[in-house]
């Protein structure tokens, strides 16, 4: 088949990292500099992709291969194939059109990107807070007060859960 | 909004010589091949040469008689054109792509075209 395919079309002996330069009888030319082609046969070669300014090479463009691109620290990739590189902010904080903010009262955000999400109600499941959540902690749930033996039914019931950084009033 | 501007057409006699200009504006020519097309009243396109990372490939029509180049810092682009024939007479194009060579792709952008007329 692939003899029969080669008869037919020359350009099907062009290997990866060359083109079949139909000006010049169909001849496999190597791609220039900076551009590459990943498969063979290929009429064109595709131009090598340039990570500048807030991106950077992860991976060097080859004749066979793109080049691959991640973001600058202070920033994370976004999008197929680290399309956009978005600013980082601090765990308990979320990106907005205006920055950084932190995040309201109820909610968190444990890593340096994404959007603040709401503590997890432990009574939805039966359950009790053991630790109170933060800016950058969720709430721990804990048993149920049910679960509990009777010998710990004296437990101080854990305050209710509160900004962090506020002194308990 | 990508603009790309041809000047440098004109009247020239055979035998003669001019050089087109091609200049970018709202992006660099860096991440793109840069190519030029012509088309002559009633016929079909023709593929005249692309230019990318030092390299230039063109047409079968033009017997060395093209030459593009590029001049990075005023992010511009040049076709000169020597021993220019009548049969060079057509509306030149300058147009750029992610694929080099462009003979068989159609451009990302183009511009408006410059004319060019061979006569005595």
């Known amino acids: 088949f692939e003899r029969t395919r080669s008869l037919q079309d020359p350009c099907s002996n062009c290997p990866a990292g060359t083109f079949c330069d139909n000006n010049r009888n169909q001849i496999c030319s190597p791609c220039p500099p900076n551009s590459f082609s990943s498969a063979g046969g290929q009429r064109t070669c595709d131009i090598c992709r340039q990570c500048k300014g807030v991106f950077r090479t992860r991976k060097e463009c080859s004749s066979t291969s793109n080049a691959e691109c991640d973001c600058t620290p202070g920033f994370h990739c976004l999008g197929a194939g680290c399309s956009m590189c978005e600013q980082d902010c601090k765990q308990g904080q979320e990106l907005t059109k205006k920055g950084c903010k932190d995040c309201c009262f109820g909610t968190f955000n444990d890593q340096k990107r994404g959007i603040c999400r709401p503590w997890t109600n432990c009574s939805l499941d039966g359950k009790s807070v053991l630790v109170n959540g933060t800016k950058e902690r969720d709430v721990v749930c804990g048993p149920s007060p049910a679960d509990l033996s009777p010998g710990a039914s004296s437990v101080t019931p854990p305050a209710p859960a509160r900004e962090p950084g506020h002194s308990p009033q | 909004e990508v603009q790309l501007v041809e000047s440098g057409g004109g009247l020239v006699q055979p035998g003669g010589s001019l050089r087109l200009s091609c200049a970018a504006s709202g992006r660099t020519f860096d991440n793109y091949a840069v190519g030029w097309f012509r088309q002559a009243p009633g016929k079909e396109r023709e593929y005249v040469g692309t230019?990318?990372?030092?390299?230039?490939h063109y047409g079968d029509f033009e017997n060395n008689r093209f030459t593009i180049s590029r001049d990075n810092s005023k992010n511009t682009v040049y076709l000169q054109m020597n021993n220019l024939r009548p049969e060079d007479t057509a509306v030149y194009y300058c147009?750029?792509?992610?694929?080099?060579?462009?003979?068989?792709?159609?451009?990302?952008?183009q511009g408006q075209g410059t004319q060019v007329t061979v006569s005595s």
């Open positions: 147009a750029i792509s992610l694929k080099y060579p462009m003979a068989t792709v159609t451009p990302d952008y």
């Open positions: 230019y990318w990372s030092g390299y230039a």
